[in-house]
């Protein structure tokens, strides 16, 4: 007996074959004997089957001999053994229907579970094997569960299921909610303008939800919520600012913060948080923001950053074309009686300069320039 | 009154290179994006290039991507575009455009234009 | 990418007469459509942004209307000022794109 397997919602053309390259009389038939389909003449006639809408034949292949089932919008329980009648013999055709979905919506955030569910015809025994967008392979029966997705399993997952040595392929595409970077970090100037952005790693026609900016600065005992926003249709309206700092919100994705200059008082940590319509949970992202001040009190020139740097950062003082002055893995380094030049200021990883500032030291008898 | 006033368009040979300036003046430069527009008889009017308030972020459409930057002073109320590997399809009138948002959004003034030929 | 297709190319209006000029996405774009008047020698002006609104200074013989992809300029009596380009701009998402234009000419 051949078995041919069929996807829920697709369509299946079971073939039968006459030894007689003409057209002859065929009958198609159920395994309880009712007909579904057969021939006239040159007519297609129907029978009572719970098929009739949607079983169909190709007249253009009776002349050949050929005289296959079509079943359009296949269901699970189409699953059953197909009989063609002709030439006084039969042919034989299991059809085992499956279908594949996710069991929640396609669209997930970041860090929850999907599961898939296979719906297969009572007797079968199928396996199914899940391959992710990143190359990952899951294995299982029934049901496949995946937990903690990430930004890489956002793609179309194609899953195979095994059946009587055949095979048929499902298609799933999963979006996974998520910014595209989990945390970023931005180095400024004290006075310069600082903007926070925070794309996100999916596109969708409408998006709906509501969102806030939770900051914690370096100097603070506590974080306070410095915006809250809500999105409506991709359009984004601020609903509360702080007075201090006031920011500025972008009314277009992706979503984007404007702090009118930085402030020692204002380095720290952030958390922006995005609160989808009709999703649990929400999306994160971190932002760090690290202010530098360079400055001269009498004798003595000074160059701090505040916020969120790491140990192996290097600070250092240095001349204008010269070599560094002091260079410390500290957040204030300072020089005694700097002679009259350009000083710079680096913050620098690994050699390479994250953040810049430059002071002018005049002769003693004048006062600094800031450039 | 605000106003936008282009300059650097040239006649190029293809695959050369060109900087276009865009000096700004009547309003608060650096609280605004900037965009660059170019027009042609055939395309009609098209997106090249946009720059944040702060200058931090910039978007591209795919066809400039790679090969035109845009950027910003705003110390001296400047835009800039560096065109790089010209081609004869670039060959337009640049429009320097302000948004009516801090990032972007549509364009609510635009400069009087200066002319690019790619040409050999 | 959100495409924009304005129609028509070109209209001959007599004076005092309604002029229509339609802009149909591909996407929906809620109610995110611009529209600008260019005349020659001249950039494009601003004359409608976003939600249907009208820009200060533009006379309210000038209006538009829809919401989703299909989207509707109007001059209710045709002036002889009014000969101009007239672009539409959907400005829901990046890449931001134009309509073709729409040549308008006194008949």
């Known amino acids: 007996k051949k078995v041919v397997l069929g996807k829920k919602g697709d369509t299946v053309e079971l073939t039968c074959t006459a030894s007689q390259k003409k057209s002859i009389q065929f009958h198609w038939k159920n395994s309880n004997q009712i007909k579904i389909l057969g021939n006239q003449g040159s007519f297609l006639t129907k029978g009572p089957s719970k098929l009739n809408d949607r079983a169909d034949s190709r007249r253009s292949l009776w002349d050949q001999g050929n005289f296959p089932l079509i079943i359009k919008n296949l269901k699970i329980e189409d699953s059953d053994t197909y009989i063609c009648e002709v030439e006084d013999q039969k042919e034989e055709v299991q059809l085992l229907v499956f279908g594949l979905t996710a069991n929640s919506d396609t669209h997930l955030l970041q860090g929850q579970s999907l599961t898939l569910t296979l719906e297969s015809p009572p007797g079968s025994s199928p396996s199914v094997q899940c391959r992710s967008p990143r190359g990952k392979n899951i294995q299982g029966g029934k049901t496949l569960s995946v937990s903690q997705l990430e930004l890489q399993d956002s793609g179309t997952w194609t899953c195979t299921v095994l059946q009587n040595q055949k095979k048929v392929e499902f298609k799933i595409d999963i979006v996974v909610l998520a910014f595209q970077k989990a945390s970023s970090i931005v180095y400024k100037k004290e006075g310069e303008q600082v903007e926070f952005s925070f794309p996100l790693a999916f596109t969708v026609e409408k998006l709906t939800g509501s969102g806030e900016l939770w900051w914690q600065a370096e100097r603070a005992s506590s974080s306070k919520s410095w915006i809250t926003f809500d999105l409506k249709n991709k359009e984004v309206s601020v609903k509360r600012v702080t007075q201090d700092p006031k920011l500025q919100m972008g009314k277009k994705l992706p979503l984007h913060l404007t702090l009118p200059q930085a402030l020692p008082q204002y380095a720290g940590s952030g958390n922006l948080t995005l609160a989808l319509e009709a999703k649990t949970g929400k999306l994160h992202q971190e932002v760090n923001l690290v202010v530098m001040r360079a400055t001269q009190l009498q004798k003595n020139l000074t160059c701090e950053v505040w916020g969120p740097t790491s140990p192996k950062l290097m600070l250092s003082l240095k001349l204008e074309n010269k070599e560094a002055k002091v260079s410390k893995r500290e957040k204030a380094v300072w020089v005694l009686n700097p002679e009259a030049g350009m000083w710079q200021c680096l913050l620098s990883d690994s050699g390479q300069v994250l953040l810049e500032s430059n002071i002018k030291v005049l002769p003693t008898w004048s006062t600094p320039v800031q450039p | 009154e605000v106003q936008l006033v282009e300059s650097g368009g040239d006649l190029v040979k293809p695959g050369g290179s060109l900087k276009l300036s865009c000096a700004a003046s009547g309003f608060t430069f650096s609280s605004y994006g900037m965009s660059w527009v170019r027009q042609t008889p055939d395309k009609g009017l098209e997106w090249v290039a946009t720059i944040s308030s702060g200058g931090s972020y910039t978007y591209y459409p795919d066809n400039v991507k790679g090969r035109f930057t845009i950027s910003r002073d705003n110390a001296k109320n400047t835009l800039y575009l560096q065109m790089s590997s010209l081609k004869s399809e670039d060959t337009a009138m640049y429009y320097c455009?302000?948004?009516?948002?801090?990032?972007?959004?549509?364009?609510?003034?635009w400069g009087q234009g200066t002319t690019l030929t790619v040409s050999s | 990418e959100t495409t924009v297709t304005q129609s028509p190319a070109s209209l001959s209006v007599a004076i005092g007469e309604k002029v229509t000029i339609r802009c149909i996405t591909s996407t929906d774009i809620d109610d995110d459509m611009n529209w600008y008047q260019q005349k020659p020698g001249e950039p494009p002006k601003f004359f409608i942004s976003?939600?249907?609104t009208l820009r200060p200074g533009v006379p309210s013989r000038f209006s538009s209307s829809g919401y989703g992809t299909d989207f509707v300029f109007t001059i209710e009596n045709m002036l002889s000022e009014d000969v101009a380009d007239y672009y539409c701009l959907q400005s829901d998402t990046l890449p931001l794109t134009f309509g073709s234009g729409t040549k308008l000419e006194i008949k």
């Open positions: 976003e939600g249907n």
């Open positions: 455009a302000r948004h009516e948002d801090g990032n972007w959004n549509y364009f609510d003034y």
